[in-house]
């Protein structure tokens, strides 16, 4: 069983491996994993006080 690399992820990392649909690349573990879709809520009606918090669709199980 191999150990994961300990170098910083992100901007300096090589381009992630393409993942199949319904997966995305997780820079933390350097692996394609099941992914849900981020979604932004519908705008509140005019006059609403504060913007609704952003939420997400659950990943497919």
């Amino acid at each position: 069983m191999r150990r994961g690399p300990r170098s910083l992820r992100g901007r300096d990392a090589p381009a992630p491996t393409p993942c199949v649909p319904a997966e995305c690349f997780d820079l933390l573990v350097r692996h394609c994993v099941a992914c849900g879709l981020l979604r932004t809520p519908r705008p509140k009606p005019a006059g609403a006080s504060s913007p609704a918090p952003r939420t997400a669709l659950q990943p497919q199980e």
Partner: antibody, heavy 125, light 107 residues
């Protein structure tokens, strides 16, 4: 329903070994990464190790490297933490957790969404 | 390793108060920060991920903001069930690291 159940904790003498199990249901562990996080009595959370069960890739906190081994059996949908050469400072509640991901520009926007109930490991003579 | 420093370490507040907890990363972690709530004897519960996204089922009085090195968790109107300890965590790079926690107590 997603559920994680840890077992295997207990009292062990310094230098001894324990094997913790994390049985998952409601999802397939090979689709996610599984993490162990511990919490010493009265202290904060400390990440211990992670595994991507689909390929067995792992990583460890420096404090446990060379002593602990994380593994997974995808046929049993279960992750494990083998703990050897235990020390008093390893005394803690050990949690397993699933890391969930949502698609974003940088790949995964993720966090640990489901946690087990925890299992207490006490290292004492 | 990236250090996550939370402040304050504890605070006293009343029901209905607006509460703000901050977390500072020792280096840029983009928006790869989550917030958790933990009550005594229980496992942590996810509140916020990717700095500002509310996790499913979490009340909308919780919100998160920030990017880079400075992050904030806000409870807009504290409820009795919100008295707990809150942790930030970065997952920009391994090892993922937690803040030391902020205990929210009843005034």
């Amino acid at each position: 329903e997603v559920q994680l159940v840890e077992s295997g904790g207990g009292l062990v003498q310094p230098g001894g070994s324990l094997r913790l199990s994390c049985a998952a249901s409601g999802f397939t562990i090979s689709s996610n990464s599984i993490h162990w996080v511990r919490q010493a009595p009265g202290k904060g959370l400390e990440w211990v190790a992670w595994i991507t069960p689909s390929d067995g890739n792992t990583d460890y906190a420096d404090s446990v490297k060379g002593r602990f081994t994380i593994s997974a059996d995808t046929s049993k949908n279960t992750a494990y933490l083998q703990m050897n050469s235990l020390r008093a400072e390893d005394t803690a509640v050990y949690y397993c957790a699933r890391r969930v991901c949502y698609s974003s520009v940088r790949g995964c926007a993720g966090a640990m969404d489901y946690w087990g109930q925890g299992t207490l490991v006490t290292v004492s003579s | 390793d990236i250090q996550m420093t939370q402040s304050p370490s504890s605070l006293s507040a009343s029901v209905g108060d607006r509460v703000t907890i901050t977390c500072r990363a020792s280096q840029d972690v983009s928006t790869a920060v989550a917030w958790y709530q933990q009550k005594p004897g229980k496992a942590p519960k996810l509140l916020i991920y990717s700095a500002s996204f509310l996790y499913s089922g979490v009340p909308s009085r919780f919100s998160g903001s920030g990017s880079g090195t400075d992050f904030t968790l806000t409870i807009s109107s504290l409820q009795p069930e919100d008295f707990a300890t809150y942790y930030c965590q970065q997952s920009y790079t391994t090892p993922p690291t937690f803040g030391q926690g902020t205990k929210v107590e009843i005034k």
